[in-house]
Amino acid sequence: KESCDVQLYIKRQSEHSILAGDPFELECPVKYCANRPHVTWCKLNGTTCVKLEDRQTSWKEEKNISFFILHFEPVLPNDNGSYRCSANFQSNLIESHSTTLYVTDVKSASERPSKDEMASRPWLLYR
C-alpha cells in the first residue's frame, strides 16, 4: 500500500550539468494525498540550507503528481551547488534528497568538457 504522506521524489545524489547563460528549470516532484503542502527550495551552504526567498518558482500539475519548479533565467556561474526542496504541512517538514547543479561558465572555459569528463571529473566545472 502506497504511503499517504507527502513524498518528494528527488533521487539521491541526482545531478544536472548545465551551461551558464541558458534557462533551466529545477523540478521537485511532489506527491500528496489531501491538500497541497507549502513547498520551498533552499541552497546548501555547508551544513545549512539557505531558503531561496525571492527566486521565481511555479507549479506544474499532472494527474498523479505535481512539480514545484525553481526557475533559473538564466543560469549564473554562482548557481553552481546543491539544492533541496522541502514540504511543510500541518507542522510536518519533509525534506528531499539534495540535487547538485554543475554549472559550466562558457565564457571562462576555453573548451567545453565532454559529458564523460563532467561525470568522471566534476572538478573541471569549477575552473
Epitope: 506527491k31 489531501a34 507549502h38 511555479s58 500539475e61 494527474k63
Partner: antibody, heavy 121, light 108 residues
Amino acid sequence: EVQLVESGGGLVQPGGSLRLSCAASGFTISSYDMHWVRQATGKGLEWVSVIGPAGDTYYPGSVKGRFTISRENAKNSLYLQMNSLRAGDTAVYYCAREGMAAHNYYGMDVWGQGTTVTVSS
Amino acid sequence: EIVLTQSPATLSLSPGERATLSCRASQSVSSYLAWYQQKPGQAPRLLIYDASNRATGIPARFSGSGSGTDFTLTISSLEPEDFAVYYCQQRSNWPPITFGQGTRLEIK
C-alpha cells in the same frame, strides 16, 4: 449555506492603499485554495492571488510586491492588502474558493458578489 | 505563462440551437481546465471543472471535452438564460493562473 461576502472597496488615490475583506460562511477557508480575481469594467477576468491550505501564497507579476493575501482562521476571513495602487488596478474584486486536492482539480466553485475598487485622483 | 485563446469572440445563435465554444492553450494544460459563465452584474459561475466534469447543479445540456491544448464547451440546446459570457481558465502551470479573454454568446 456556503457563501462569500466581500467588503472594503472604495475610491482611493494613485499610490494609496486599501484592504479588502472576504467573510466566508458554511465552510472553513483554511481547507481550500482561496483566491482573489478581478475584473475591470467591460474586460475579462484576471487572477490576482491565492493562499493555499498550508498558507503558501502566490501572485502574478502585475501585483507581486504590492498586494498581500492573508487569512484569519478564527474569523474565517480572507484579506487582500493592496498598496501602491495604480489606475490599472481599478476593477471589481471577487474572492473565490477553489478545491484542489490530491492532484485533482475542482475549479472555483464559490464566488462572492464582488467589491468595487476605483483608483483615481 | 500559459495563454488561453477563446473563439469565437462572439457567437450569435437562437434558442434551441447548439453552441460550440473553443479554448486553445499555448501549451499543454493536461485536463486542468475549467469553464465559467458570467451574466452582466453577476459573479462568474463554475460550469465545468477538470475539462469535462459538470459542477454541482449545472444542467446536462452543458458539456466539456478536450485535453492538452484544445478544449470545447458545448451547450446542446440553448435556453434563453444561457446567453452570457463564457470563460475558460487553466490551473496546470501556475502562477499565474490564467483565463481566456471570453466568448460572448448572444441571441441572434
